[in-house]
C-alpha cells in the first residue's frame, strides 16, 4: 500500500511540477522592470524567453517576439534549451510513469517491468527538474549581473544635457514558478525512485521458511531457493513465501535487478 501511495504521489507531484515548468517557460515575466526608485511608471517593461512586453499606463499591453535566433544572447539560448529539455524529459517521464503505476493494469505486465519503468520515469523527472532549476538559475544569475552593471552605469551622459536611463530588470514571477516547479519535479522523481525499490525488493527481503517433508529434511535458506536437497527427489528450485498475509505491494513475482544505462 505504501509503495502504491509513494508512486502515486510521486506521479502527481511530478505532474504538477512539469505543468509548472511548461507554464514558466511560456510566461512573459522572466524579468520585470525594477520599480525600486519609481513604483509608479508610465511604461512597464517585462521580458520572457520568447518575447518582451510593455504594459502602458493607458492599460494597453504590447509584446514583441524575438524574431531572431542568431542575434539572441547565448545564455538566453541556453536557458531556452534547458527548459525545453526539461519539458521533453518530463513529458516522456509522465508517459512512462502512467504505464508504470501499480493501480493501472496493462495486460500481463510483470511487476519487474513496472519497477523498471518507475525507475526510468523517476530518473527522467529528476533530470527534468534539474534542467528547469538550472535554466532558471542561469537566467537569474544573468539578471543579477546585468542589474549591477546597469546600476553602475545608471546614467550615461550624452553631451551633458541628455541622459539615457537604462531600464533595470529584476526577478519576474516566472523565475519563482520555475524554481518551485523544478523542485516539485525533482521531489516527484525521487519519490518514484523510492517507490521502485519497494516494487521489486531484493532477495534478502524474503523471510526464511522451514519446510518439513515426511522422512526427509529439506532446508530452505533465506534466499528463497533450495540450497540443499539432501537426498530428496524434488530437484526443482522453488520459491517459498511464508503463509502470512501480505499486501499486494509486498507480494512480488520475481526479484529483479534494475540496470539503467
Amino acid at each position: 500500500m505504501a509503495v502504491t501511495a509513494c508512486q502515486g504521489l510521486g506521479f502527481v507531484v511530478s505532474l504538477i511540477g512539469i505543468a509548472g515548468i511548461i507554464a514558466a517557460t511560456c510566461m512573459d515575466q522572466w524579468s520585470t522592470q525594477d520599480l525600486y526608485n519609481n513604483p509608479v511608471t508610465a511604461v512597464f517593461n517585462y521580458q520572457g524567453l520568447w518575447r518582451s512586453c510593455v504594459r502602458e499606463s493607458s492599460g494597453f499591453t504590447e509584446c514583441r517576439g524575438y524574431f531572431t535566433l542568431l542575434g539572441l544572447p547565448a545564455m538566453l539560448q541556453a536557458v531556452r534549451a534547458l527548459m525545453i529539455v526539461g519539458i521533453v524529459l518530463g513529458a516522456i517521464g509522465l508517459l512512462v510513469s502512467i504505464f508504470a503505476l501499480k493501480c493501472i493494469r496493462i495486460g500481463s505486465m510483470e511487476d519487474s517491468a513496472k519497477a523498471n519503468m518507475t525507475l526510468t520515469s523517476g530518473i527522467m523527472f529528476i533530470v527534468s527538474g534539474l534542467c528547469a532549476i538550472a535554466g532558471v538559475s542561469v537566467f537569474a544569475n544573468m539578471l543579477v549581473t546585468n542589474f549591477w552593471m546597469s546600476t553602475a552605469n545608471m546614467y550615461t551622459g550624452m553631451g551633458g544635457m541628455v541622459q539615457t536611463v537604462q531600464t533595470r530588470y529584476t526577478f519576474g514571477a516566472a523565475l519563482f514558478v520555475g524554481w518551485v516547479a523544478g523542485g516539485l519535479t525533482l521531489i516527484g522523481g525521487v519519490m518514484m525512485c523510492i517507490a521502485c525499490r519497494g516494487l521489486a525488493p531484493e532477495e534478502t527481503n524474503y523471510k526464511a521458511v522451514s519446510y518439513h517433508a515426511s522422512g526427509h529434511s529439506v532446508a530452505y535458506k533465506p534466499g528463497g531457493f533450495k540450497a540443499s536437497t539432501g537426498f530428496g527427489s524434488n530437484t526443482k528450485n522453488k520459491k517459498i513465501y511464508d503463509g502470512g498475509a501480505r499486501t499486494e505491494d509486498e507480494v512480488q513475482s520475481y526479484p529483479s535487478k534494475h540496470d539503467y544505462v
Epitope: N38, A42, V43, F44, V54, S58, E62, R64, Q163
Partner: antibody, heavy 118, light 113 residues
Framework: QVQLVQSGAEVKKPGASVKVSCKAS????????VNWVRQAPGQGLEWIGM????????RLNQQFKDKATLTVDKSTSTAYMELSSLRSEDTAVYYC???????????WGQGTLVTVSS | DIVMTQSPDSLAVSLGERATINCLSS????????????LTWYQQKPGQPPKLLIY???TRDSGVPDRFTGSGSGVDFTLTISSVQAEDVAVYYC?????????FGQGTKLEIK
C-alpha cells in the same frame, strides 16, 4: 462617436474652489484613463494628472498634488477635477482627454476656461 | 521630470513646401520591452483643443493625412509635413508618454509665408 463634453466657463475669486466636469460618451468609460491638461493663456500644455474610472485610481503630477483632486462618477460616465485654493496663476483652459495607445491623448474635451480674479 | 525641447519656436513656410519640426528629449523615450518610442505629436489650432497626429513617434492616428510623418528614436524626434497646406497653420506640440509626469514641448508655431 467618442465625445468628451466639459462644463462651462467659470469665474472664481482667489482662495475659492472650482469643480470642472467632463462627461464621456461613445465608448466604454471604465476602460480608459481620463487625463486633465491645462493651458494658461498664450502658453503651452501642462499635464495635471489622470484618473481611471473603474477603480478611481489616480496618477497626479507632483506639481498639482495640493491643487487638483480627480474623481469619477461611473453611473453618469463623468470625470471631475476639483481645483482648490485658486490663485490668479490658475487662470487657464482646462482640458480632459482620453488616453490611448502609446500614452497618447486621442480625444479631447472642448476645454473649460477658469478665470481667477478678485 | 523629462524635459521636452522643441525647435524652432516658430516656422514660416510657403504652401506646398516641406516643414520640419524637431523635438529633443532629456531622456530616452525608447521602451526596451517593445522597442517603441513613447513620443506623441499634437496639432492645436487657435481656439481648439489639441488634436492627436502621431503616437509611438511614427504611427499616424486614424484620419491624419499622410503628409504628416513622424520619425526619430531615443531622444531625437522629427515631425515632417511634406507639403504644407493652408489648414496646417497651427501650433505643434511633442509629448513624452514614457514616464510620469507626462511633459510637453513648448510648442512650434507654423505659419504660411
Amino acid at each position: 462617436q467618442v465625445q468628451l463634453v466639459q462644463s462651462g466657463a467659470e469665474v472664481k475669486k482667489p482662495g475659492a474652489s472650482v469643480k470642472v466636469s467632463c462627461k464621456a460618451s461613445g465608448y466604454s468609460f471604465t476602460n480608459y484613463w481620463v487625463n486633465w491638461v491645462r493651458q494658461a493663456p498664450g502658453q503651452g500644455l501642462e499635464w495635471i494628472g489622470m484618473v481611471h474610472p473603474s477603480g478611481s485610481e489616480t496618477r497626479l503630477n507632483q506639481q498639482f498634488k495640493d491643487k487638483a483632486t480627480l474623481t469619477v462618477d461611473k453611473s453618469t460616465s463623468t470625470a471631475y477635477m476639483e481645483l482648490s485654493s485658486l490663485r490668479s496663476e490658475d487662470t487657464a483652459v482646462y482640458y480632459c482627454a482620453r488616453v490611448w495607445s502609446g500614452n497618447a491623448f486621442d480625444y479631447w474635451g472642448q476645454g473649460t476656461l477658469v478665470t481667477v480674479s478678485s | 521630470d523629462i524635459v521636452m525641447t522643441q525647435s524652432p519656436d516658430s516656422l514660416a513656410v510657403s504652401l506646398g513646401e516641406r516643414a520640419t519640426i524637431n523635438c529633443l528629449s532629456s531622456q530616452s523615450l525608447l521602451a526596451s520591452g517593445n522597442q517603441r518610442n513613447y513620443l506623441t505629436w499634437y496639432q492645436q489650432k487657435p481656439g481648439q483643443p489639441p488634436k492627436l497626429l502621431i503616437y509611438w513617434a511614427s504611427t499616424r492616428d486614424s484620419g491624419v493625412p499622410d503628409r504628416f510623418t513622424g520619425s526619430g528614436s531615443g531622444v531625437d524626434f522629427t515631425l515632417t509635413i511634406s507639403s504644407v497646406q493652408a489648414e496646417d497653420v497651427a501650433v505643434y506640440y511633442c509629448q513624452n508618454g514614457f514616464s510620469f509626469p507626462f511633459t510637453f514641448g513648448q510648442g512650434t508655431k507654423l505659419e504660411i509665408k
